[in-house]
Interface confidence: medium
């Protein structure tokens, strides 16, 4: 019968060539009677064997990425009769693995959105890297995640590539942030390789700042003979948010006098001071009203940020005209 | 510090002319209506005249309108009351005071120069 | 225009006393529009109370305004030396209008 152990070739050997092992028939009594041949994908040129004693060796550098088996078939023959001592049989050769090949980020570019204020712990995303080389030979293809740049806003999980927040940001002061993710095989030991991804992370915003005046005073004037619904100017307020968030709505806090109202253009965020009723130069020629801004929409675990309304003082001086 | 200190009183005939300046220090003067305000000797207090902060308004007492300009020179931190065709019920101390942001009262007022018309 | 009137013309008072001075107006003023100043002898006024009855910065407490549309009051709770001075009313709404003062003297 036949007798060999399992073969094994270590890939990117960089010999002309390399013993592998030996196909022998017990039969054989080392007179140099039979003649061993190699058949199958590879025999003759990736793997030769030597006739007379059954030494196989591998005569070209190996890729296990590339193929990582063999499956030849082995025949002797009596030199004398020409006949087969052995029936033909089929042998594999495995290509063993060494880490040559770095850890890969297959999906970037990666890119989440997370909404600004998130707690530490927040999940953000997961980053995923491949390695090429044999995930059960050894630590070749262990993978170990670090993170080279976002540090304190970011961490990532060693073994699961999760990046969480680990400090509360905040949209108004950075709204986007670059990641960089190391992933390590050979669970960062000695003779380790390394790849590399970027994240971009955007923060979402979140309505944690209120409408404030742009001015503490505004002065306006109103002619007398002004109808009541005339428009007799505009005051603003600016928000740090974005979109929704910064819809805000004026109105009237304070007018003794009940002359004035407030209304809110929704397209450029202004208010409009509007005459209720005519003024009279005669029996009052100056007003002064207070006016507050809020924002349109707060959710209720964000009202801690919108305490207090701002508020601007308006002082309007009534324009005299000549009566007949 | 904060202060308002009136200077240009003296004594004039009627029907002349006199200019009164007011120099603001410590604050910033550029964002206040300013006022002058006067007082005949032994009697109340009346307002004379007003400058909105950015000299774009001005408004005066009945007993002054066109015979008395206010103005202001904000690069300067100064504000002026130039007097002309005076009269003998001119006569009084002369105060500049500044407005409030927040209302048209007087929270503060310069030591006051007199102003005497006699012929 | 608003005509401003104080009550009394002098009031005689010792130190420690409670002052009480009455501004009454032609026609009704909003409390926002009134104010109070103390001038003492060779001074200029002085802001004690606005908007009827806020005390103005650094006015010690024993001040205190109030009122309402056509009656105010200013009302000083118990008399200082340095309190002994002339004190007007001013209305505010329409132009600036100032009552002739109210004496607070030395009994």
């Known amino acids: 019968g036949w007798v060999w152990n399992q073969f094994f070739v270590p890939e990117e050997m960089n010999t002309t060539s390399h013993h592998i092992g030996q196909l022998r028939s017990d039969l054989d009594n080392g007179n140099n009677s039979f003649q061993y041949k190699l058949l199958g994908a590879g025999a003759g040129s990736t793997f030769i064997i030597d006739e007379r004693t059954g030494d196989i060796y591998a005569i070209q550098k190996l890729d296990r990425e590339e193929r990582s088996l063999y499956i030849l078939r082995a025949q002797v023959i009596d030199i004398a009769t020409g006949r087969a001592v052995e029936p033909e049989s089929e042998f594999v050769i495995k290509v063993s693995d060494i880490n040559d090949n770095e850890p890969k980020f297959l999906d970037e570019p990666y890119e989440a959105i997370v909404p600004e204020m998130s707690p530490e712990g927040t999940l953000v995303i997961q980053v995923t890297a491949s390695d090429a080389d044999d995930p059960s030979s050894g630590n070749n293809a262990r993978l170990l995640y670090s993170l080279l740049q976002g540090q304190p806003y970011f961490s990532v999980e060693p073994t699961t590539g999760v990046i969480r927040i680990s400090s509360k940001m905040d949209r108004e002061l950075q709204d986007e942030y670059w990641v960089i993710i190391q992933a390590k095989d050979m669970i960062g030991q000695p003779g380790a390789l390394s790849g590399t991804t970027s994240v971009l992370i955007k923060l979402s915003d979140v309505n944690d700042n209120k409408p404030i005046f742009k001015e503490s005073l505004y002065r306006l004037t109103v002619s007398e003979s002004a109808p009541t619904g005339t428009s007799i100017g505009t005051i603003m307020a600016y928000d740090n948010d974005i979109g929704e968030n910064a819809e805000m709505d004026y109105s009237i806090e304070e007018d003794d006098s009940q002359t004035f109202d407030i209304i809110t253009n929704h397209e450029t965020q202004e208010g409009i001071v509007i005459l209720k009723k005519k003024v009279d130069f005669e029996h009052q020629n100056h007003y002064g009203i207070r006016a507050k801004v809020k924002n349109h929409h707060v959710p209720e675990q964000l009202m801690k940020y919108h305490t207090e309304a701002s508020t601007t003082f308006i002082k309007i001086q009534v324009e005299d005209v000549d009566e007949p | 510090q904060v202060q308002l200190v009136e200077s240009g009183g003296g004594v004039v005939q009627p029907g002349g002319s006199l200019r009164l300046s007011c120099a603001a220090s410590?604050?910033?003067?550029?964002?206040?209506?300013m006022d002058w305000v006067r007082q005949a000797p032994g009697k109340g207090l009346e307002w004379v005249a007003v400058?909105?902060?950015?000299?774009?308004?001005?408004y005066y007492a009945d007993s002054v309108r066109g015979r008395f300009t206010i103005s202001r020179d904000n690069s300067k931190n100064t504000l002026f009351l130039q007097m002309n065709s005076l009269r003998v019920e001119d006569t009084a101390v002369y105060y500049c005071?500044?407005?409030?942001?927040?209302?048209?009262?007087?929270?503060?007022w310069g030591q006051g120069t007199l102003v005497t018309v006699s012929s | 225009e608003i005509v401003l009137t104080q009550s009394p013309g002098t009031l005689s008072l010792s130190p420690g006393e409670r002052a009480t001075l009455s501004c009454r107006a032609s026609?009704?003023?909003?409390?926002?529009?009134l104010a109070w100043y103390q001038q003492r002898p060779g001074q200029a006024p002085r802001l004690l109370i606005y908007?009827?009855?806020s005390r103005a910065t650094g006015i010690p407490d024993r001040f205190s305004g109030s009122g309402s549309g056509t009656d105010f009051t200013l009302t000083i709770s118990s008399l200082e030396p340095e309190d002994f001075a002339v004190y007007y009313c001013?209305?505010?709404?329409?132009?600036?209008?100032f009552g002739q003062g109210t004496k607070v003297e030395i009994k």
């Open positions: 005071a500044r407005e409030t942001g927040e209302g048209w009262y007087f929270d503060l």
């Open positions: 410590g604050f910033s003067f550029s964002s206040y209506d």
């Open positions: 400058i909105w902060y950015d000299g774009s308004n001005k």
């Open positions: 026609q009704s003023v909003s409390s926002s529009y």
């Open positions: 908007g009827a009855s």
């Open positions: 001013q209305q505010y709404g329409s132009s600036w209008t």
